[in-house]
């Protein structure tokens, strides 16, 4: 699994809605694959972490002044939707086919 | 200044192009304000860090399993351009009015 010593990458993160208290309004699924972005943004930043110019600059400054400036951070750069069956304000079960921004599609250094 | 104990925010980061070796092709400015996103993404995530649903979910999972899952990360969510005078491939001084993605406009939790 990707830790602080490995490069920025997408790793599995199964989220159980009961664990986060969302089972009170989400009926299904019981859990889903959210993914997590893990690992470091080390110099030189590879193309696959799609670094912004600012991330490149910050990485170079961190190399020069590691105690003053942090590295860029490995974060979701593109998110995917999931489908959820949830209770609306009136408690009526409703199917949301695209519940946006719930799962990581891509990770990158920002 | 914003440290790990403070909430995610934009802080000053003056970048000198000589420090990062870019003075070989950037003629002016000699330095600029890049800003840096610093601080933690603590529960509950405030509106001003414009959290995605995934960041909210990850924050809740981190609360439940702090050793298994990391917090969301404070990163630039919007970048601004700067103007630069640089040497093109032929060594000709050229003004790039909008050199995109060089300075942080907004920070958020992702």
């Amino acid at each position: 699994s990707a830790g602080a010593g490995s490069h920025c990458q997408k790793t599995s993160l199964r989220v159980n809605f009961e664990d986060i208290g969302w089972d009170s309004w989400i009926i299904a699924p019981k859990e889903y694959e959210a993914y997590e972005c893990k690992g470091g943004c080390f110099f030189p930043l590879a193309d696959d972490v799609t670094p912004t110019k600012h991330a490149i600059v910050q990485t170079l400054v961190h190399l020069k002044f590691p105690t003053k400036v942090g590295k860029a951070c490995c974060v979701p750069t593109k998110l995917s939707p999931i489908s959820v069956l949830y209770k609306d304000d009136m408690g009526v079960p409703t199917l949301k086919y695209h519940y946006e921004g719930m799962s990581v599609a891509e990770c990158g250094c920002r | 200044s914003a440290g790990a104990g403070s909430h995610c925010q934009k802080t000053s980061l003056r970048v000198n192009f000589e420090d990062i070796g870019w003075d070989s092709w950037i003629i002016a400015p000699k330095e600029y304000e890049a800003y840096e996103c610093k601080g933690g993404c603590f529960f509950p995530l405030a509106d001003d860090v414009t959290p995605t649903k995934h960041a909210i979910v990850q924050t809740l999972v981190h609360l439940k399993f702090p050793t298994k899952v990391g917090k969301a990360c404070c990163v630039p969510t919007k970048l601004s351009p700067i103007s630069v005078l640089y040497k093109d491939d032929m060594g000709v001084p050229t003004l790039k009015y909008h050199y995109e993605g060089m300075s942080v406009a907004e920070c958020g939790c992702r």
Epitope: A28, P29, Y32, P81, P93, S103 | -
Partner: antibody
Amino acid sequence: QVQLQQSGAELVRPGTSVKVSCKASGYAFTNYLMEWIKQRPGQGLEWIGVIHPGIGVTNYNEKFKGKATLTADISSSTAYMQLSSLTSEDSAVYFCARRANWDLYYFDYWGQGTTLTVSS
Amino acid sequence: DIQMTQITSSLSASLGDRVTISCSASQDISNYLNWYQQKPDGTVKLLIYYTSSLHSEVPSRFSGSGSGTDYSLTISNLEPEDIATYYCQQYINLPLTFGAGTKLELK
């Protein structure tokens, strides 16, 4: 193994209704969404809608609202699609398909299709 | 609705050929694209999801690529059982929409 067995071909009169069935086996029927797709002769595929079999909640393509009604019977692990006020435009092959997962937007198993012919 | 266009409605190829089937969307669909195969007997199978992920039990001669509005399905070494009609499908927006299909025939 996962199987979706659809009802046989239908020849019906214009203005009538028809109910197509899709019997699921080899998996937990209530844990997966069931989707329905239309294919007219020599044409592409059209998404009709989706049902959560466990609760009966549906989403429809606007184009098929009032035309298609999706239901499910948990006891027999069967999904149904009723088509009403039939016209020649409804003559097509209709497929049921299992949605692979809540966080994956693809159909991993399909029925064999039910041919509907609307003719006077 | 997002329109999915498969410009080539039919394609002739020989066994062993490398075949590429294209699909374009009326707007950026961010790789939210699947490919399905429909055999002459009408049976439909999933081949590829999310642009390039091969579904289980699908032979590795099938591959998918693309981004933005332009996508393609490639069969690297055409086999007799690959004779079928291939459909692309987007899922970034409702309603889900499919291409009109590309019928692959033997030369």
